[in-house]
Amino acid sequence: MKVLQEPTCVSDYISLSTCEWKMGGPTNCSAELRLVYQLVFLISETNMCVPENNGAAGCVCHLFMEDMVGADNYTLDLWAGQQLLWKGSFKPSEHVKPKAPENLTVYTNVSETLLLTWSNPYPPDNYLYEKLTYAVNIWNENDPTDSRIYDVTYQEPTLRIAASTLKSGVSYRARVRAWAQSYNSTWSEWSPSTKWYNAYKEPFEKHHHHHHHHHHH
């Protein structure tokens, strides 16, 4: 039994790290393999993860970690019974993939402005709580080419956009993801999307002027 692609891990920097690897051939990951991990510290428990299959030869393991600090380092040992297949280490702070933002809501009743809000997925005592910035993806449900990304480079989990920038009488969807620049993280997964109907109508004067102008051509 051989490891074809060594484990690579990412951490949400609160409680969960996910490691993935590929074996040399079809493997029943949960029956044949164990990933043992331990924090390099004075008082730390040895933990064991039972991997799941990710395709015929791929394995994935969810490592539970608690109270992470920036300097944390874990030893990782991949076992097949009594045989040590691979030995490595993992520093969560250097491989951060934030949790996805939660509770994305779109408010359409704020005059001619769309207000999108979501919640930071971290509690206030976590380092990432004050470090996340966001990207919001808005797209037209009926036209895949009508899609845009808004970079939210401030920390407030809100975005205001003019309803007039979107097509009137169309259903739109939005989703949001996060990253932590200071920890050189990857982007989080996208949040679940939320849907709304853009009922914005152009003001009469503008509409009338537009129509008149058109008539002369």
Epitope: I14, S15, L16, V40, F41, L42, I43, F64, E66, D67, V69, G70, A71, D72, S93, P123, P124, D125, Y127
Partner: antibody, heavy 116, light 112 residues
Framework: EVQLVQSGAEVKKPGATVKISCKVS????????MHWVKQAPGKGLEWVGR????????IYASKFQGKATITADTSSNTAYMELSSLRSEDTAVYHC?????????WGQGTLVTVSS | DIVMTQTPLSLSVTPGQPASISCRSS???????????LEWYLQKPGQSPQLLIY???NRFSGVPDRFSGSGSGTDFTLKISRVEAEDVGVYYC?????????FGQGTKLEIK
């Protein structure tokens, strides 16, 4: 052997500032959160705040926001707490404690007395 | 803030007899990672506190097995199966799940 050795007792006048230290041996402070806990004379324990020495990220109990400032020097493996605008109610023993992820190691405490 | 309420506030026990201290939190102390960071500390006279129990039920290394922790949700209990003279001091429960972290007001254990 793990030791958290705190600086000696301090007597300060109201309005003054005091900075107390907690020198750690036996482990690297970057590997834990360093917390401070207050114990007023004859009273119970009160959590003040904590620091992640790796990145300097601090968090405080709201009543100590603006009162306490926690810092850490990883090169000397020492945590500090500064208390400003001292008043008589700040008179207490202050303990430094490492938490990973529970309070396993405590300093011996530093008595700060505020008296005119 | 989460308030941790201990009962009783004082306890006088004959050596060899059991003792029980209750700790109630004003709201759930389950952390977002699923753990319950409920701990028990003993502060012996003239000493710094020492850890007895972590995560509700786990005895810290070197703690005698006469100490046990139990509970869930908002109600937690520390039991000493047979009190010994060295157990005197003030016992504190503590929640480390939600900032600001909070201690109970303490329970003083004396020997009869």
């Amino acid at each position: 052997e793990v030791q958290l050795v705190q600086s000696g007792a301090e007597v300060k006048k109201p309005g003054a500032t005091v900075k107390i230290s907690c020198k750690v041996s036996g482990f690297n402070i970057k590997d834990t959160y360093m917390h401070w806990v207050k114990q007023a004379p004859g009273k119970g324990l009160e959590w003040v705040g904590r620091i992640d020495p790796t990145n300097g990220y601090t968090i405080y109990a709201s009543k100590f926001q603006g009162k306490a400032t926690i810092t850490a020097d990883t090169s000397s493996n020492t945590a500090y707490m500064e208390l400003s605008s001292l008043r008589s109610e700040d008179t207490a023993v202050y303990h430094c404690v490492s938490r990973r992820p529970w309070f396993a190691y405590w300093g011996q405490g530093t008595l700060v007395t505020v008296s005119s | 803030d989460i308030v941790m309420t201990q009962t009783p506030l004082s306890l006088s026990v004959t050596p060899g007899q059991p003792a029980s201290i209750s700790c109630r939190s004003s709201q759930s102390i389950v952390h977002s990672n699923g753990n319950t960071y409920l701990e028990w500390y003993l502060q012996k006279p003239g000493q710094s506190p020492q850890l007895l129990i972590y995560k509700v039920t786990n005895r810290f290394s070197g703690v005698p097995d006469r100490f046990s922790g139990s509970g869930s949700g908002t109600d937690f209990t520390l039991k000493i199966s047979r009190v010994e003279a060295e157990d005197v001091g003030v016992y504190y429960c503590f929640q480390g799940s939600h900032v600001p972290y909070t201690f109970g007001q303490g329970t003083k254990l004396e020997i009869k």
